[in-house]
């Protein structure tokens, strides 16, 4: 398992929510990506392919997510101060082998301006 801080902008704020960007190498074909808040699994997305090369995308812990050819974005809405925490992208690479797990993360700071419903 490889642990480290994300070397890219992991958090993108918009409209009182946050997009958490979990990147993976272009060469990865099949994988599971989990979003962890502290040690708790918040969201996950698994991409696999069958023997006819058809793609299957599954989520056991569903969040609004978006898949590209080198990242999974998870979206959290209605931000409040309780969202401030360490978030980790836990990537399990199935294909190409060998099987590998990498963990990258960062701290989500919540500022007044990013809150969903500020008191005037």
């Amino acid at each position: 398992e490889i642990n480290g801080s994300a070397n890219y902008e992991m958090f993108i704020f918009h409209n009182g929510g946050v997009q958490i960007l979990c990147k993976y190498p272009d060469i990865v074909q099949q994988f599971k990506m989990q979003l962890l808040k502290g040690g708790q699994i918040l969201c996950d997305l698994t991409k696999t392919k069958g023997s006819g090369n058809k793609v299957s995308i599954k989520s056991l812990k569903f969040c609004h997510s978006q898949l590209s050819n080198n990242s999974v974005s998870f979206f959290l809405y209605n931000l409040d101060r309780s969202h401030a925490n360490y978030y980790f992208c836990n990537l399990s690479i199935f294909d190409p082998p060998p099987f590998k797990v990498t963990l990258t993360g960062g701290y989500l700071h919540i500022y007044e301006s990013q809150l969903c419903c500020q008191l005037k």
Epitope: S51, N53, D95
Partner: antibody, heavy 117, light 111 residues
Amino acid sequence: EVQLVESGGGLVQPGGSLRLSCAASGFTFSDYWMDWVRQAPGKGLVWVSNIDEDGSITEYSPFVKGRFTISRDNAKNTLYLQMNSLRAEDTAVYYCTRWGRFGFDSWGQGTLVTVSS
Amino acid sequence: DIVMTQSPDSLAVSLGERATINCKSSQSLLSGSFNYLTWYQQKPGQPPKLLIFYASTRHTGVPDRFSGSGSGTDFTLTISSLQAEDVAVYYCHHHYNAPPTFGPGTKVDIK
């Protein structure tokens, strides 16, 4: 150790039906696509059908489409193949196989289906 | 459907000698960095066994006398030094799209 054990084969008349089962153990069944591959006596390998991890995607060979149905029960770790309108040319050993992401990495011993009057 | 052909149909090789099996696909199996081509070995009375995936990567536990090469439409399985336990039928197989198809097989015997 991964184990796949097929059952349900036998002798059936043309036009008849059979249901094959494959009991899986030694791995997390619900994490893998599964396939059926068949082999007629003395002949080569022919892919029959596959199913994704939760059964929401299925694919079939043109030879069996509309006659065979693949399904799975993840609670029972079991793969099925319902075969209807059987023909003499369906006579074969039917193998249950695990699609291990980039190849059929585990195979059962096979179950023989004979279609004959 | 992609058609897979193999040559020769059969070959007999002396123990310790090299055996070479060719496989050709009717269209390219290359997508991105990967050739979607696998090789299987089937010994008499047994189910097939995965040998090589992505055209050239040996599966876990496969002896290094087995090697795969090729790209696009032309592929080769080589057994560098044939052993008695290598007597089998060898199949190439593609998983580029549906339906995945197998070659007709090449039977390898001891001369």
